[in-house]
Interface confidence: low
Amino acid sequence: TSSASSSSSSAPFLASAASAQPPLPDQCPALCECSEAARTVKCVNRNLTEVPTDLPLYVRNLFLTGNQLAVLPAGAFARRPPLAELAALNLSGSRLDEVRGGAFEHLPSLRQLDLSHNPLAYLSPFAFSGSNASISAPSPLVELILNHIVPPDDKRQNRSFEGMVAAALVAGRALQGLHLLELASNHFLYLPRDVLAQLPSLRYLDLSNNSLVSLTYVSFRNLTHLESLHLEDNALKVLHNGTLAELQGLPHVRVFLDNNPWVCDCHMADMVTWLKQTGVVQGKDRLTCAFPEKMRNRVLLELNSADLDCDPILPPSLQTS
């Protein structure tokens, strides 16, 4: 199989004019640009405070970026007749701080959703499943892009941000068909334990530029379709045997580990041995030690067991102050 682009990016856009008349089904909403040939509507940087009600039925690609939407209520895109062709929805940078349950209901063809760069103080557990049933109807989503959706500290709810996002990803097992998930730049300290088990179709997972310290409690075992795992720019110190074995067991995966503060002591021995023989890690020759000080900037692939020692732990009576 081969890939190609099927939509025309050079199709003319029709800027709409505000009208007192009720909208026709394929009329362009005020403050938007529309191209029926490209099946695209762009309502970009217009300070919109709500989703236009009069979107044309032909819309396949909808850009609502750079607005001031604040809240996405249930049924925000529900129309009669429904927007049956809407496949790609970009809401990035629209000052959303609340996405409620069922916000994306009645979009039967929605394959790609981008909520990046919105400070989501509240993401409903049912934002993507649309229902509080233990098993919901499958979502059509294939690509979910949630980069930099962490709110400022003063806007966070009491519960953990990681837990809030995880609850939305696993609710009703609705996202079992998801192929791509981007969660970069969200200050994640950990990945909730059961999230990946509910996303068995993932091919591409981006967790870069977070604050992940450890993957000890994360299981990649069932992600048999995973092709790209991005863990760059986190706070990882070492990968332990269980994680190494799981990654090695994934048939198609490529793992990206650059710019983590690797601690090159005796606990690193297994990872170094694995790195020397694995083909899984991309750019493995670029990985360097950050700690201890004497090992800083040493290349992991060039280390041997004699380099990887741990200071003995002295009994309290022998410790010096």
Partner: nanobody, 120 residues
Framework: EVQLVESGGGLVQPGGSLRLSCAAS????????MSWYRQAPGKGLELVAS????????RYADSVKGRFTISRDNAKNTLYLQMNSLRAEDTAVYYC?????????????WGQGTLVTVSS
């Protein structure tokens, strides 16, 4: 591995009919909109018809409206194109297309095509 295999093409006289099929595998067929495209000799790719996930909404090129019907059977993972009242200008290679996502993964898949020749 995603695979799309078209069949049903061939030589037909003007005014005749053909039914093209596209057997899909390697992805959850029922979750994706599907399309038929065609490419006539020396011409560009033209969208012929598309159908949404459950088959509730279809669209057609003006040149085939009223003559062609797109349908799908999600239970059989198969897309169809019923072509009636065929004309010489319908001669082309017809391609099945699954738009699985335009973003990072090159997930816009095509079959190998099936040739339809309309000639007396």
């Amino acid at each position: 591995e995603v695979q799309l295999v078209e069949s049903g093409g061939g030589l037909v006289q003007p005014g005749g009919s053909l039914r093209l099929s596209c057997a899909a595998s390697g992805f959850t067929f029922s979750s994706y909109a599907m399309s038929w495209y065609r490419q006539a000799p020396g011409k560009g790719l033209e969208l012929v018809a598309s159908i949404t996930t459950a088959g509730g909404s279809t669209r057609y090129a003006d040149s085939v409206k009223g003559r062609f019907t797109i349908s799908r059977d999600n239970a059989k993972n198969t897309l169809y194109l019923q072509m009636n009242s065929l004309r010489a200008e319908d001669t082309a290679v017809y391609y099945c297309n699954a738009e699985l996502g335009p973003r990072r993964l090159g997930m816009d898949y095509w079959g190998q095509g099936t040739l339809v020749t309309v000639s007396s």
